[in-house]
Interface confidence: medium
């Protein structure tokens, strides 16, 4: 068959949709692979073709756009299911071509079943709300383009299995759900069910997201180094193992990159010749404040190593801090005979 630029299976776009609900899927070619949009391609005489491979099959098949009630259709660069069926699961390919040009990409589509409490294998997006921060809203996601603005859908919100009505601090407002003051108890899965009419039929869109209540920026502080500190001195004899923990507390900050690192005599451990290992562990509080611990370890420390400067550094969007560890060589205990001699000499 004719040669075609094949972008392969785009597993980054693992699309999951609920069974028996409408789904609109844009051809990824125009979003991620090509430098022009569908309108440009169409006006240049390029044709967009859709086909698919069923789950557990190798055979590429055309998509039957001639099903009763137009269940599957294509509109510009969008593939429509009105609605999906469980056996629509498979790998879908959109191919753009004319007599001289061809480009195609495949992507997996999984049609997922949900139970009466909206539990399903669907990967859920996470929406973070700041604790005790005033009114915050979440919006029912991925419903654009399903119905025209002239259609007024009905929207019902649920927390877990329960319809949200007469909740203390959570108020449904159409496509939005307002949290008057977010608390840890508001953590959980929230579902909006959007119901709209189309051509004498009624369709439902179910969208579930996870709400996670996190630390407020009002309470955020620069990183706090708990260890090393001025109260602990790391006294070692040559040949012993030196272990210095650097423990840093980071306030939760949206999209902040938290970093911890050691320097030895002002250099990163990788840039010096001594045999150093660094192990990191991370823990989170209920509001996603983070504690990072990096343990610097030198198996057999030398007297040279004990003279070096060991500094723990930490950085977040709130600032950068550093703290030096107090390291010193243990002075050997005086031998008994020397002590006695000194004692006699003193009398």
């Amino acid at each position: 068959s004719e040669r075609c630029d094949d972008w392969g299976l785009d597993t980054m776009r693992q699309i999951q949709v609920f069974e028996d609900e409408p789904a609109r899927i844009k051809c990824p070619l125009f979003e991620h692979f090509l430098k022009f949009n569908y309108s440009t391609a169409h006006s240049a005489g390029l044709t967009l073709i859709w086909y698919w491979t069923r789950q557990d099959r190798d055979l590429e098949e055309p998509i039957n756009f001639r099903l009763p009630e137009n269940r599957i259709s294509k509109e510009k660069d969008v593939l429509w299911f009105r609605p999906t069926l469980l056996n629509d699961t498979g790998n879908y390919t959109c191919m753009l071509r004319n007599t001289t040009y061809c480009s195609k990409v495949a992507f997996p589509l999984e049609v997922v079943q949900k139970d009466s409490c909206f539990n399903s294998p669907m990967k859920l997006p996470v929406h973070k709300l700041y604790i005790e921060y005033g009114i915050q809203r979440i919006t029912c996601p991925n419903v654009d383009g399903y119905f025209p603005s002239s259609v007024k859908p009905t929207i019902t919100w649920y927390m877990g299995c329960y319809k949200i009505q007469n909740f203390n601090n959570v108020i449904p407002e159409g496509m939005n759900l307002s949290f008057l003051i977010a608390l840890i108890s508001n953590n959980g899965n929230y579902t909006c069910v959007v119901t709209y009419p189309e051509n004498g039929r009624t369709f439902h869109l179910t969208r579930t997201l996870t709400v996670k209540v996190v630390g407020s920026p009002k309470n955020a502080v620069p990183p706090v180094i708990h260890s090393p500190n001025d109260h602990v001195v790391y006294e070692k004899e040559p040949g012993e193992e030196l272990l210095i923990p650097c423990t840093v507390y980071f306030s939760f900050l949206m999209d902040s990159r938290n970093e911890v690192w050691w320097t030895i005599d002002g250099k990163k451990p990788d840039d010096i010749t001594i045999d150093v290992t660094i192990n990191e562990s991370i823990s989170h509080s209920r509001t996603e404040d983070e504690t990072r611990t990096q343990i610097l370890s030198i198996k057999k420390v030398t007297s040279e190593d004990l003279k070096r400067s060991y500094v723990c550094h930490a950085r977040s969007a709130k600032g950068e801090v550093a703290k030096a560890a107090k390291v010193k060589q243990k002075v050997p205990a005086p031998r008994y005979t020397v002590e006695l001699a000194c004692g006699f000499g003193a009398t």
Epitope: T47, P62, F65, E69, G200
Partner: antibody, heavy 119, light 108 residues
Framework: QVQLLQSGAEVKKPGSSVKVSCKAS????????IDWVRQAPGQGLEWMGG????????NSAQKFQGRVTITADKSTSTAYMELSSLRSEDTAVYYC????????????WGQGTMVTVSS | EIVLTQSPGTLSLSPGERATLSCRAS???????LAWFQQRPGQAPRLLIH???RRATGIPDRFSGSGSGTDFTLTISRLEPEDFAVYYC?????????FGGGTKVEIK
């Protein structure tokens, strides 16, 4: 410019079969659906079925299922429609039509093939 | 199956006049998959309009399509002598594809 050229007129006996060909020239054949539409004398248009040559899978109207076989030969850019168990009411002009792209409108038609079923 | 009903069956008009042809569907034609064809005697049909209102390549702008759901219209703003023919609407989204019974536009 794409053209669809159909085979010549046929006279068939009731109960026999007819196979009409439709050869595409001047464009990419395999990616477009080729559909078959018939028109009885003095009547309207009736869709029979279609095939996308690149995949080889055909679908047809329920009325013709079991009687119509639609195939395509990519190497010769030719689609075929075979209708079996012919009866007098199958007397019609049979057209092939190119379907813009899988589900778009019939933007190109063959010249038609007259099939007469008579004893 | 979507049944398409065209009206009137025959339209008698003079050149230069406006022609309005109707096509009504028994069920809604979603995705705007509705086309109009012109067929002159002894010829194959010719695509005029697809997607309800998009003119096919080479079709003069005196032909226009409109409508949605179940009611569609083909308008010929000023009839030319070559426009006297039979016109068919077709829905091509839902199987089986179906055509209307046709409207004959004849010279008065």
């Amino acid at each position: 410019q794409v053209q669809l050229l159909q085979s010549g007129a046929e006279v068939k006996k009731p109960g026999s079969s007819v196979k009409v060909s439709c050869k595409a020239s001047g464009g990419t054949f395999s990616i477009y659906a080729i559909d078959w539409v018939r028109q009885a004398p003095g009547q309207g248009l009736e869709w029979m079925g279609g095939i996308i040559p690149i995949f080889g899978t055909a679908n047809s109207a329920q009325k013709f299922q079991g009687r119509v076989t639609i195939t395509a030969d990519k190497s010769t850019s030719t689609a075929y429609m075979e209708l079996s168990s012919l009866r007098s009411e199958d007397t019609a002009v049979y057209y092939c039509a190119r379907n813009g792209a899988t589900s778009d409108a019939f933007d190109m038609w063959g010249q038609g093939t007259m099939v007469t079923v008579s004893s | 199956e979507i049944v398409l009903t065209q009206s009137p069956g025959t339209l008698s008009l003079s050149p230069g006049e406006r022609a309005t042809l109707s096509c009504r569907a028994s069920l809604s034609v979603s995705s705007n998959y509705l086309a109009w064809f012109q067929q002159r005697p002894g010829q194959a049909p010719r695509l005029l309009i697809h997607g309800v209102s998009r003119r096919a390549t080479g079709i003069p702008d005196r032909f226009s399509g409109s409508g949605s759901g179940t009611d569609f219209t083909l308008t010929i703003s000023r009839l030319e002598p070559e426009d006297f023919a039979v016109y068919y609407c077709q829905q091509y989204g839902s199987s089986p594809l179906t055509f209307g019974g046709g409207t004959k536009v004849e010279i008065k």
